[in-house]
């Protein structure tokens, strides 16, 4: 992912990591009634050669990986990103203090891949 | 990108970069007849707060960005990945030396976003 900011260890391969997000931690508790939080998850890890089947790599990611190996200073590796996302339903107050139930798309990471 | 592991400088924002891929450089010239190469492009750049409209961010990416701000050591920023990909047609020799024209999906990056 874009944030391999200061690690000196070997990164694990691209995969889904568990992450619970609390709406209170985000400061959203005053307008979100329910749920109190949700399992958002996130993607992280290396997209290194060879990209195996578990990595859900696109054709472009495979080509980019090969170009990176030839030209690592100018072309980055593909990055580990969500390939499947789910929605969640949220009960919240709108600007007029009405209680609204709304489905928010692309909120939960179900699967990750190299893109 | 995955290799900007320890930088403290500001990277440019997530965007599409031009990249021409030569099939000869990849060592594929013996089986790919045409084209000789193609404009594959790639995505690179920061997915930093705030994620503006140009960054084609998903709801999950927006949430992840906020969690990263609270907890940068454990949760990475979203990564800059293709949001739109195009196919290319390739003329090649198969294992039996037949000439085949095939459309390969997801070969060209048309747009990038934060995921």
């Amino acid at each position: 992912s874009a944030s391999d900011y200061n690690s000196s260890e070997l990164k694990t391969a691209c995969r889904k990591h568990e992450l619970y997000v609390s709406f209170q931690d985000l400061g959203w508790q005053d307008w979100i009634i329910a749920p109190k939080g949700y399992a958002a998850n996130y993607c992280d890890g290396e997209c290194s050669f060879p990209l195996n089947a578990h990595m859900n790599a696109t054709n472009h990611a495979i080509v980019q990986t090969l170009v990176h190996l030839m030209n690592p200073e100018y072309v980055p590796k593909p990055c580990c990103a969500p390939t499947k996302l789910n929605a969640i339903s949220v009960l919240y107050f709108d600007d007029n203090s009405n209680v609204i139930l709304k489905k928010y798309r692309n909120m939960v990471v179900r699967a990750c891949g190299c893109h | 990108s995955a290799s900007d592991y320890n930088s403290s400088e500001l990277k440019t924002a997530c965007r599409k970069h031009e990249l021409y891929v030569s099939f000869q450089d990849l060592g594929w010239q013996d089986w790919i007849i045409a084209p000789k190469g193609y404009a594959a492009n790639y995505c690179d750049g920061e997915c930093s707060f705030p994620l503006n409209a140009h960054m084609n961010a998903t709801n999950h990416a927006i949430v992840q960005t906020l969690v990263h701000l609270m907890n940068p050591e454990y949760v990475p920023k979203p990564c800059c990945a293709p949001t739109k990909l195009n196919a290319i047609s390739v003329l090649y020799f198969d294992d039996n030396s037949n000439v085949i024209l095939k459309k390969y999906r997801n070969m060209v990056v048309r747009a990038c976003g934060c995921h």
């Epitope: 391999d4 290396e46 030209n71 100018y74 | -």
Partner: antibody, heavy 121, light 111 residues
Framework: QVQLVESGGGLVKPGGSLRLSCAAS????????VHWVRQAPGKGLEWVGR??????????AYAASVKGRFTISRDDSKNTLYLQMNSLKTEDTAVYYC????????????WGQGTLVTVSS | QSVLTQPPSVSGAPGQRVTISCTGS?????????VHWYQQLPGTAPKLLIY???ERPSGVPDRFSGSKSGTSASLAITGLQAEDEADYYC???????????FGGGTKLTVL
């Protein structure tokens, strides 16, 4: 033609600081990744670090042996690469080279002549 | 201790063929990264000799060739000449963070 010229080397005491410069000419400096490589007397080449081009946000990386002590920067308007060296140790004594990375296969296709840094009390 | 392993020295008579090996691991050469070779004549800066594992920059004689297989690479010099006497270094990248790695260098002596 492509030219890289290092300067700023000299004698410095342990714990001291020094700033090396590498003046580039004959090419579009801002579009290239550039590195520092050093060579201790009678020894092999050792990678020090690099700074990427403007397109890649000038991101830096360093060898473990210099991380936290050395800082690489560049000024594209002056076509110059810098290496700020702090908390110098005797083992930092070496000829320091700057090198340009060619854009198709990432080889170091042009090197400066080197500048000698001697760390001694 | 260098990440890439080269023999400290090799030698050959004029006209002979010599090879210099460069052995890495699954995190560098074995990860698929290209290998570059540099020639350093006495008292001078290194010069790119082979790039992309097997390609020669313009001006480099075809007596010099490079190859790569698995976790190692090699540089071959045919028709050895006195002016080939120099130090030779291989270079690649480490896949965990795309950091540059060098071999320890090989001193070529022309007998």
């Amino acid at each position: 033609q492509v030219q890289l010229v290092e300067s700023g080397g000299g004698l410095v005491k342990p714990g001291g600081s020094l700033r090396l410069s590498c003046a580039a000419s004959g090419f579009t400096f801002s579009s290239y990744v550039v590195h520092w490589v050093r060579q201790a007397p009678g020894k092999g080449l050792e990678w020090v670090g690099r700074i990427k081009d403007h397109k890649q946000g000038y991101t830096t990386a360093y060898a473990a042996s210099v991380k936290g002590r050395f800082t690489i920067s560049r000024d594209d308007s002056k076509n110059t690469l810098y290496l700020q060296m702090n908390s110098l140790k005797t083992e930092d004594t070496a000829v320091y080279y700057c090198a340009r990375v060619e854009r198709s296969k990432s080889g170091f296709d042009n090197w400066g002549q080197g500048t000698l840094v001697t760390v001694s009390s | 201790q260098s990440v890439l392993t080269q023999p400290p020295s090799v030698s050959g008579a004029p006209g002979q063929r010599v090879t210099i090996s460069c052995t890495g691991s699954s995190s560098n050469i074995g990860a698929g990264y290209s290998v570059h070779w540099y020639q350093q004549l006495p008292g001078t800066a290194p010069k790119l000799l082979i790039y992309g594992s097997s390609e020669r920059p313009s001006g480099v004689p075809d007596r010099f060739s490079g190859s790569k297989s698995g976790t190692s690479a090699s540089l071959a010099i045919t028709g050895l000449q006195a002016e080939d006497e120099a130090d030779y270094y291989c270079q690649s990248w480490d896949s965990s963070q795309t950091l540059v790695v060098f071999g320890g260098g090989t001193k070529l002596t022309v007998l």
